[in-house]
């Protein structure tokens, strides 16, 4: 059974992940972002089901495409802190939350999504899990 300290750690990690995803989304949705139209042409795979921490496998599998889109987006009006650092921090948190050796084979929905839909889906996931922990 999870201890109160492990639950607290999980909650903090989810909150960190949530903030990182929200920061990316806010940057993309910035009305000054000149590359938004181009960014929306990139397609992301969405999980069929995302209700447990192990389903973060599906986010892990999309980190390289996410990094590529954010690299494309960098401009004077859209500037995240180092994209590589941001994606790597997300990578580390995801591995800690789901376990670095999960054997789950992610199931994806038939329809692909834009980066905005993709980020919103994972933001909702984090918020949902956090609410069950608090």
């Amino acid at each position: 059974a999870p201890t109160s300290s492990s639950t607290k750690k999980t909650q903090l990690q989810l909150e960190h992940l949530l903030l990182d995803l929200q920061m990316i989304l806010n940057g993309i949705n910035n009305y000054k972002n000149p590359k938004l139209t181009r960014m929306l042409t990139f397609k992301f795979y969405m999980p069929k089901k995302a209700t447990e921490l192990r389903h973060l496998q599906c986010l892990e599998e999309e980190l390289k495409p996410l990094e590529e889109v954010l690299n494309l987006a960098q401009s004077k009006s859209f500037h995240l802190r180092d994209t590589k650092d941001l994606i790597s921090n997300i990578n580390v948190i995801v591995l800690e939350l789901k376990g670095s050796e999960t054997t789950l084979m992610c199931e994806y929905a038939d329809e692909t999504a834009t980066i905005v839909e993709f980020l919103n889906r994972w933001i909702t996931f984090c918020q949902s899990i956090i609410s069950t922990l608090t």
């Epitope: 892990e60 599998e61 999309e62 980190l63 390289k64 495409p65 990094e67 650092d85 994606i87 790597s88 921090n89 990578n91 580390v92 591995l95 800690e96 670095s100 050796e101 054997t103 084979m105 992610c106």
Partner: antibody, heavy 118, light 108 residues
Amino acid sequence: EVQLVQSGAEVKKPGESLKISCKGSGYRFTSYWIGWVRQMPGKGLEWMGIIYPGDSDTRYSPSFQGQVTISADKSISAAYLQWSSLKASDTAMYYCARQQVAGMLDYWGQGTLVTVSS
Amino acid sequence: EIVLTQSPGTLSLSPGERATLSCRASQSFSSSYLVWYQQKPGQAPRLLIYGASSRATGIPDRFGGSGSGTDFTLTISRLEPEDFAVYYCQQYGSSPLTFGGGTKVEIK
């Protein structure tokens, strides 16, 4: 279960060509980088380069750029490391490994021993 | 490229003792990129620690990682017979990815 299975040991002569393979299973092969690492006899680990099978994006360590070619065939979940003209100094154990975006090599193949001798 | 220097080269200890391995980088980078591996003779390396301090699944809690900037440490709180091996640190803070030269932990 995530597995990377490498092709068998090779004994070659200097000047010959060679292509060794690494087959992935138990995960979505197109979603992770595959890295190649060299370990010369009695020595440490050296990163050679990586390939992302999803789009064949390939990056090399400057030390190995032009010396080897890394490729992949996503239809059969395989990555390859090849030489066009082997040298005695290429004698080593070569490992493939799945590489996360943050750089950790979380799953490793069993290694392929390449011996180059006249 | 970032050069990683591991010390000591060899550590001679007895089972039950504490092992402290050092990895020093030639330039600073985020701890997200610091990794430790264990390699036993005739085997492929195995991921131990990622993100400087996170244990990979299945790694006993006697293994711990710490550090930031340019100085990182791997600690084995109580050496078990199966822990005698070579340990490598690795970074990917900047390309190319590089490994330290390794520290051999041998039985005294």
